[in-house]
């Protein structure tokens, strides 16, 4: 990667750590698999860091799949569930904080937030369930963290966040503690690659959250997820943000980065859209 | 001091339409949602749409995107409500109600305008 | 649609009795988007409750608020005559936004 420019970052002589879950699977989408029974499951949902009911068709899917709601978050929930995360870098804006809100082309609608570069705000929108853009959030948090400007014009990630004990959701704290390895980034970053439904073999990268790298896979050309980027620098802008880590000397290091103002383009015209 | 003042009752025939006004006053219109909600006598709320009138947005409930138009006059900080082709179950007390544009708690509400539909 | 069904439809009570009202969702909703709304008669409806838990301005401490998930509770730990009223519990989770058919709390 060429490295001039004036995006800031900190550098370390290792990769920057991978999120703590327990086990990989539970990062996996849900899979009902191709058989018709009607088995109620519980699967992991890593946007709302909680073990849920899915409807399982009895054969094949994947491994995130639980007989029951215990067993789910035996595997997949941690024990400290008071952890902190604290970042405290100093960023620009990602250029996806600009798109217009977008609900995309489902229709399973449900309330996100976005960055509204009118009023300079976060905002709650109406979104479809799929696809849209990259400028939409789960939380409101997620969404100020990432877009809004802090108290002196820049954009500062200024959130201790602390994991609710209670529902496992994220929920802000103003106390400032030190920095652990934690993904604090877009929840896209921890969804799976994801090729999508058309046929073109298409060089791309996403960012692998077990192993806190970005990773090339080849994309469809068509559908898949917002974990898809044209370049490697790109994936690392978007999802590596996510991570802070203390340098042992007690400072951070910058670099400049050459910043590329490619975005991900995809085609939508083969995606055959399940009803919601 | 906040306050949504609505327009005046209606008696209106079936498959007439109506167009309701709430003016507000307090607060700046432009950065909140409008929300329009009817209750039916001795019934439950039921959520018709939402207007956010700097840009226009607006959400509907479906099943009402037919019959519902939500628009606003960012210069009399009005909001209004049209609903087409009314029949005898539209029959209600229409209100709207404000919330912020980052949640939905409605925080402050018009007095409400009865619509009777009646041949 | 999430349809919100509230529980009982008509709970009768004397003032300084405990009053438990319920509100069961289709489909689980998150309890930040879970409110509950106030209304008495010749009113229009009052924000009560916001998030599950927090009351709104002027609320009094005997009203709590708990639940996750498809079941929510609004509770009055001792009733006073001014509390009887009807109450709506309200999500704004998923579109459209859907509120409950309402709790009436009447004096018995």
């Known amino acids: 990667d060429s490295e001039e420019d004036e995006e800031h970052t900190i550098i370390t002589d290792t990769e920057l750590p991978p999120l703590k879950l327990m086990h990989s699977f539970c990062a996996f989408k849900a899979d009902d698999g191709p058989c018709k029974a009607i088995m109620k499951r519980f699967f992991f949902n890593i946007f709302t860091r909680q073990c849920e009911e899915f409807i399982y068709g009895g054969c094949e899917g994947n491994q995130n799949r639980f007989e029951s709601l215990e067993e789910c978050k035996k595997m997949c929930t941690r024990d400290n569930a008071n952890r902190i995360i604290k970042t405290t870098l100093q960023q620009e804006k990602p250029d996806f904080c600009f798109l217009e809100e977008d609900p995309g082309i489902c229709r399973g609608y449900i309330t996100r937030y976005f960055y509204n570069n009118q009023t300079k705000q976060c905002e709650r929108f109406k979104y479809g369930g799929c696809l849209g853009n990259m400028n939409n959030f789960e939380t409101l948090e997620e969404c100020k963290n990432i877009c809004e400007d802090g108290p002196n014009g820049f954009q500062v990630d200024n959130y201790g966040t602390q994991l609710n004990a209670v529902n496992n959701s994220l929920t802000p704290q103003s106390t400032k503690v030190p920095s652990l390895f934690e993904f604090h980034g877009p929840s896209w970053c921890l969804t799976p690659a994801d090729r999508g439904l058309c046929r073109a073999n298409e060089n791309r990268f996403y960012y692998n959250s077990v192993i806190g790298k970005c990773r090339p896979f080849k994309y469809s050309g068509c559908g898949g997820n917002e974990n898809n980027f044209t370049s490697k620098q790109e994936c690392l802008r978007a999802c590596k943000k996510g991570f802070i880590q203390r340098i042992s000397k007690g400072g951070l290091i910058k670099t400049k980065r050459k910043r590329k103002k490619q975005r991900v383009k995809i085609a939508y015209e083969e995606i055959f859209v399940k009803n919601m | 001091e906040v306050q949504l003042v609505q327009s005046g009752a209606e008696l209106k025939k079936p498959g007439a339409s109506v167009k309701l006004s709430c003016k507000a006053s307090?607060?700046?219109?432009?950065?909140?949602?409008m929300h329009w909600v009817r209750q039916a006598p001795g019934q439950g709320l039921e959520w018709i749409g939402e207007?956010?009138?700097?840009?226009?947005?607006?959400n509907y409930n479906e099943k009402f995107k037919t019959r519902a138009t939500l628009t606003a006059d960012k210069s009399t900080s009005t909001a209004y409500m049209e609903l087409s082709s009314l029949r005898s179950e539209d029959t209600a007390v229409y209100y709207c109600?404000?919330?912020?544009?980052?949640?939905?708690?409605?925080?402050?509400w018009g007095q409400g305008t009865t619509v009777t539909v009646s041949s | 649609e999430i349809v919100l069904t509230q529980s009982p439809a008509t709970l009768s009570l004397s003032p300084g009795e405990r009053a438990t009202l319920s509100c069961s969702a289709s489909s689980s909703v998150s309890s930040s988007y879970l409110y509950w709304y106030q209304q008495k008669p010749g009113q229009a409806p009052r924000l009560w409750i916001s998030?599950?838990?927090i009351l709104a301005s002027g609320v009094p401490a005997r009203f709590s608020g708990s639940g996750s998930g498809t079941k929510y509770t609004l509770t009055i730990s001792s009733l006073e005559p001014e509390d009887f009223a009807v109450y709506f519990c309200?999500?704004?989770?998923?579109?459209?936004?859907?509120f409950g058919q309402g709790t009436k709390l009447e004096i018995k």
């Open positions: 998030g599950t838990s």
């Open positions: 207007i956010k009138p700097d840009q226009g947005r607006i």
């Open positions: 307090g607060y700046t219109f432009t950065s909140y949602w």
């Open positions: 109600a404000r919330s912020s544009v980052v949640d939905v708690a409605l925080d402050y």
């Open positions: 309200h999500q704004w989770s998923h579109y459209p936004f859907t």
